[in-house]
Amino acid sequence: AGVFELQIHSFGPGPGPGAPRSPCSARLPCRLFFRVCLKPGLSEEAAESPCALGAALSARGPVYTEQPGAPAPDLPLPDGLLQVPFRDAWPGTFSFIIETWREELGDQIGGPAWSLLARVAGRRRLAAGGPWARDIQRAGAWELRFSYRARCEPPAVGTACTRLCRPRSAPSRCGPGLRPCAPLEDECEAPLVCRAGCSPEHGFCEQPGECRCLEGWTGPLCTVPVSTSSCLSPRGPSSATTGCLVPGPGPCDGNPCANGGSCSETPRSFECTCPRGFYGLRCEVSGVTCADGPCFNGGLCVGGADPDSAYICHCPPGFQGSNCEKRVDRCSLQPCRNGGLCLDLGHALRCRCRAGFAGPRCEHDLDDCAGRACANGGTCVEGGGAHRCSCALGFGGRDCRERADPCAARPCAHGGRCYAHFSGLVCACAPGYMGARCEFPVHPDGASALPAAPPGLRPGDPQRYL
């Protein structure tokens, strides 16, 4: 058992151009806090995967207000260390995620709001009991300087906190073969007493009295080599005929992982993949509980009352993420139907409906044509917003009451002349142009640009637009 300790030295703009704007302002004073997440081994895992070694939240730092016009300085930090206790052996290699969070303290509705300012991650080797290791990590334009160490909690000692110490039995020296317990020189290292007869080469123990075998060895004292060449079944009793001894029950049999953790076998033992909120060799330790206030932006912490239960955050509308840390663009879900305009007012979503539609989500199609007539043989089209008339040729306007002049919009290009016609309009093209709207130049050699003139029509002939 022991404690991983993290000391944040500074958080501020990194070197080089593009200094970040201060995250705080006179209008929005803020303060920082940090979260650390530890995982065993050097696996490159997603930020959302469980903090199997543990997690910790810092206290809030001092309130900071930007001085107008000043560049972003190093920001004031919370006091004290972030401490992540570990119950089992220190793994020696670990991955970390350190998140810098901003708590805004302005007058926004709902009190403080939280946002993730920076996240750094790394993979390191570290022996327990060693000196502080210093590190610098950059996230975008921000730079985080910190130190960390792992220390064992007495009576554990050693680089993995697996050796135990006990008070000296004799005042002057330790017993035969036993060393003093640095830094507790007045104590002696207590040998971890494995099961009597456990092979010192092929067996090991993590608890007194046990004997666990390295890969390739089996038997109660790990003295029997495992031959796999003629083994047909992966597990079972030893076969006297083949001389093949297959290991008995596997380390994951009976699932030693608590709290819904999933077990996978490793060369030396087993490994538990723990659900969110739990860590430890058997997922028996909860890293963060509701008492730590892990739900941001007005989220409600549910469960997680004690270290044996994981918390979840119920997020207010507009936020998501396991800690309600992500703001949702609720309009991106396109909740407004029928072309309505979405407005996220913070306290509510509003849909501004197109004419002809109504309802909280513009879901009701008003009967546009009820009691409305289209003149001059026009027909009313339902559902297109404010009642729409499809007018007969030669008529236009909202109710088809206006006589349409098809040439009013000057539809003939390149100086072509427009003629109103009972079936539409006709363009008489200027020399060198052709097409329904005189849009195509005629090449000097007589070949036209696309499209070709239809058979029987010479370039320059008036073409009726149908």
């Epitope: 009190g111 403080p112 206030g293 409600l300 912490c301 997680g304 009352a305 119920h314 207010p316």
Partner: antibody, heavy 117, light 108 residues
Framework: QVQLQESGPGLVKPSETLSLTCTVS????????WSWIRQPPGKCLEWIGY???????NYNPSLKSRVTISVDTSKNQFSLKLSSVTAADTAVYYC????????????WGQGTLVTVS | EIVLTQSPGTLSLSPGERVTLSCRAS???????LAWYQQRPGQAPRLLIY???SRATGIPDRFSGSGSGTDFTLTISRLEPEDFAVYYC?????????FGCGTKLEIK
């Protein structure tokens, strides 16, 4: 502004199920969490539970085995069912909307007295 | 669960006086997730304060909230006749949501 109106029988027999409905007007039921709170005569307020339009629910552990809260988005209503009632469940039952900035109650119905007898 | 204890249970005061009501939590209320409500006789509670110190829409500025951690207060700077009612605090840091049992303000 959101308005809420509770409805349901004012008298329920012991061991039966209390059923109440809250009708929401002036806002979409899809925009908020919706909650039930009760207050026995002359006593403290007690939160019963809440529901979100997506179906997410959360109940007071003291009532969890007996309570069901559901939502009907098409009618802009949500409802409470409390089974195996006793005289101790006699109270004024309020429906309320939960604010979008946290789990406090910004709009309340006027309340309906339910007597178990 | 977080138990909220309000004190005093009843206060007898006169209009124009200043009053401070206390709400103490059995455990730390994180992020100042605490609200105050006013309940007049025969009416539903009405939201006054959220986030420990933010006034709800339409609430007069004579009402103010403060505090953090486990100790919170509601202050009414000058009592008006309509302020005589029962006042409740509620935490929304963690489930279950809990209320205090109220402080009754009565006219002396």
């Amino acid at each position: 502004q959101v308005q809420l109106q509770e409805s349901g029988p004012g008298l329920v027999k012991p061991s039966e199920t209390l059923s109440l409905t809250c009708t929401v007007s002036g806002g979409s039921i899809s925009s908020y969490y919706w909650s039930w709170i009760r207050q026995p005569p002359g006593k403290c307020l007690e939160w019963i539970g809440y529901v979100y339009y997506s179906g997410t629910t959360n109940y007071n552990p003291s009532l969890k085995s007996r309570v069901t809260i559901s939502v009907d988005t098409s009618k802009n209503q949500f409802s409470l069912k409390l089974s195996s009632v006793t005289a101790a469940d006699t109270a004024v039952y309020y429906c309320a909307s939960i604010a979008v900035t946290g789990f406090y109650f910004d709009y309340w119905g006027q309340g309906t007295l339910v007597t178990v007898s | 669960e977080i138990v909220l204890t309000q004190s005093p249970g009843t206060l007898s005061l006169s209009p124009g006086e200043r009053v401070t009501l206390s709400c103490r939590a059995s455990q730390r209320v994180n992020n100042n997730y605490l609200a105050w409500y006013q309940q007049r006789p025969g009416q539903a509670p009405r939201l006054l304060i959220y986030g420990a110190s933010s006034r709800a829409t339409g609430i007069p500025d004579r009402f103010s909230g403060s505090g953090s951690g486990t100790d919170f207060t509601l202050t009414i700077s000058r009592l008006e006749p309509e302020d005589f009612a029962v006042y409740y605090c509620q935490q929304y840091d963690r489930s279950p949501l809990t209320f205090g049992c109220g402080t009754k303000l009565e006219i002396k």
